[in-house]
């Protein structure tokens, strides 16, 4: 029987979201509760680690929200962005595989604001390579498991 | 051994992006540099050609951006759209499989604007059929390989 | 030979879209015309029913649009949202797997407005579980088959 195809679906752990508005790496994710799950991949130090060479479909869904009860925004002009990055242990450099997002004007005229980003793509990943998620304005992240998550599943071997 | 499953991940070649704000077909894509790759499919004349019947997952990520240093926009009200189309050589007509996008108001009050679209879906494709990408406002495309790309991978055979 | 992998791609049936601006479940979808298709899954009562345990990639693309010829919007501040939900017959409760969308300001200064949402993710589904789509502002849905659709395809078995 073929070795089970690796996959992961990781959902945001909002207990430890950074406070800045700059681009930060999100290191706290669930891998074993609710919709979150992982098989034949490893989650460590905020990174999804590839254990098996292959071509994988990677995806991320990132939701941002603001309610006026959370306080006044420091600026109404926001860059709400996600970057899906790959790091190789052998060559300690980070490369962005996918990016998405939007500039938004979240004015005080509305009491609630929301915006979601979805990205996905097909990439060759080698054992030991690491996938991580960077976002801007992390304190605006929606902490629900259906809102902010990323994942991967292996589609085929490398020839 | 089963024939290796076809796939492609094509990234924008920004050296030849059309000007204008109308809907145009994007014909310049990389297939063999950086994240771009192709196997058991063909890229020719700006189209991704299917070589093997099957059900494929198709996806596209299209990023638009504008910085005030690029000059004034002709209009601040924009339609930023993508259309993933299928053409059959046998029946020379084009059909839109997927579309996405947004109307945007990119005012001069902000020096930078950004917006990304992601679409994806599962389609039956026959050998010889061609997939192409049309966008509005091509001069606003983000030329990075992590920003503007499309792809496909075969999931299963046709019964 | 392995049982053929289940899949579905369902496109909106706009002849029966609810009115109103509240969150509603969309029950009318095509499964056998145009791009719409289904295999080893069942579509019944507005829900996509799983017939085979497994890990599936689920996706949805939802487009909203408004033209001034359709009349004035009741409010220019809109929440345009999609929720992909899973219901288990054994435990009659509904859980949101994925959500996406945006708050939008669709002012009367522009004659046409458009916005699309895309979500996708990898989930364990058991036979008998049902997938459905809820949206806000259903009367603003784009009725084209390339615009508003959802689907699923099985990627691997459950160990």
């Amino acid at each position: 029987k073929l070795e089970a195809q690796p996959f992961a679906h990781l959902t945001i752990n909002a207990t430890d979201i950074p406070s800045g508005s700059h681009k930060v790496s999100l290191s706290s994710w669930y891998h074993d509760r609710g919709w979150a799950k992982i098989s034949n991949m490893t989650f460590s130090n905020g990174k999804l680690i590839v254990n098996q060479d292959g071509f994988y479909y990677l995806y991320a869904n990132i939701c941002f929200r603001h309610h006026e009860t959370s306080g006044d925004l420091a600026t109404e002009y926001l860059q709400l962005m996600v970057y899906v990055t790959k790091t190789s242990i052998k060559i300690p450099s980070s490369h962005t595989l996918m990016k998405g997002g939007s500039t938004k004007y979240w004015s005080g005229n509305s009491e609630f604001h929301f915006y979601s980003i979805n990205v996905g793509g097909f990439f060759k990943l080698r054992s030991g390579e690491e996938i991580s998620i960077e976002v801007s304005n992390p304190s605006l992240l929606d902490p629900d498991q259906d809102a902010t998550y990323f994942g991967a599943f292996k589609v085929r071997d490398i020839d | 051994k089963l024939e290796a499953q076809p796939f492609a991940h094509l990234t924008i070649n920004a050296t030849d992006i059309p000007s204008g704000s109308h809907k145009v077909s994007l014909s310049s894509w990389y297939h063999d540099r950086g994240w771009a790759k192709i196997s058991n499919m063909t890229f020719s004349n700006g189209k991704l050609i299917v070589n093997q019947d099957g059900f494929y997952y198709l996806y596209a990520n299209i990023c638009f951006r504008h910085h005030e240093t690029s000059g004034d926009l002709a209009t601040e009200y924009l339609q930023l759209m993508v259309y993933v189309t299928k053409t059959s050589i046998k029946i020379p007509s084009s059909h839109t499989l997927m579309k996405g996008g947004s109307t945007k108001y990119w005012s001069g009050n902000s020096e930078f604007h950004f917006y990304s679209i992601n679409v994806g879906g599962f389609f039956k494709l026959r050998s010889g059929e061609e997939i192409s990408i049309e966008v509005s406002n091509p001069s606003l495309l983000d030329p990075d390989q992590d920003a503007t790309y499309f792809g496909a991978f075969k999931v299963r055979d046709i019964d | 030979k392995l049982e053929a992998q289940p899949f579905a791609h369902l496109t909106i049936n706009a002849t029966d879209i609810p009115s109103g601006s509240h969150k509603v479940s969309l029950s009318s979808w095509y499964h056998d015309r145009g791009w719409a298709k289904i295999s080893n899954m069942t579509f019944s009562n507005g829900k996509l029913i799983v017939n085979q345990d497994g890990f599936y990639y689920l996706y949805a693309n939802i487009c909203f649009r408004h033209h001034e010829t359709s009349g004035d919007l009741a409010t220019e501040y809109l929440q345009l949202m999609v929720y992909v939900t899973k219901t288990s017959i054994k435990i009659p409760s509904s859980h949101t797997l994925m959500k996406g969308g945006s708050t939008k300001y669709w002012s009367g200064n522009s004659e046409f407005h458009f916005y699309s949402i895309n979500v996708g993710g990898f989930f364990k589904l058991r036979s008998g579980e049902e997938i459905s789509i809820e949206v806000s502002n259903p009367s603003l849905l784009d009725p084209d088959q390339d615009a508003t659709y959802f689907g699923a395809f099985k990627v691997r078995d459950i160990d």
């Epitope: 508005s21 700059h22 006044d72 925004l73 002009y77 304005n137 | - | -």
Partner: antibody
Framework: QVQLVESGGGVVHPGRSLRLSCAAS????????MHWVRQAPGKGLEWVAV????????YYADSVKGRFTISRDNSKDTLYLQMNSLRPEDTAVYYC????????WGYGMDVWGQGTTVTVS | DIQMTQSPSTLSASVGDRVTITCRAS??????LAWYQQKPGKAPKLLIY???SLESGVPSRFSGSGSGTEFTLTISSLQPDDFATYYC?????????FGQGTKVEIK
Amino acid sequence: QVQLVESGGGVVHPGRSLRLSCAASGFTFSGYGMHWVRQAPGKGLEWVAVISYDGTNKYYADSVKGRFTISRDNSKDTLYLQMNSLRPEDTAVYYCAKCLSGTYWGYGMDVWGQGTTVTVS
Amino acid sequence: DIQMTQSPSTLSASVGDRVTITCRASQSISSWLAWYQQKPGKAPKLLIYKASSLESGVPSRFSGSGSGTEFTLTISSLQPDDFATYYCQQYNSYSWTFGQGTKVEIK
């Protein structure tokens, strides 16, 4: 470690100008709003001005409005306070302080410099 | 502008005492209140933000409560290091103001 260092203080005659600087290190400066707060000799703290992380929004106390200008250079990790038309009542120790939240106002100031003294006489 | 009034202005206490400082706002500020500690010749130090959230690294003997117009800072058991001046600071509609301060001194 996280640090803010003010400079540019000194003795100046009324009506003259002075520019204070605040050099940041140990955190992503471009991700946080920054304040200037002052303290006259033997008195309490008085808020002076604030600037958002991207520099788009600036707010001032009524006592300095029209005379003081807050600015920042994110490429140099530096905050500035341009003080014009100085008055004797502007005499104080001037502190720069980092916003606890980069996204929201109102969460307090979690990192402070050691202060720089401005004397107007 | 919103005025912040602290009481008392001076408080004499002993090590081990439970100490409470009050801050009143001239109009509602929801929970947008912070508390600071300042020692002579030093910069202020953030203790509490959003009325009741303890800043990282601050001892748990410090706590904050209140909302609207009335707020309190409580030190459950006064330690030698706690003798200092304490300031409340409000935020409301793009304006920040401090209270006049409360000096906690040794009895």
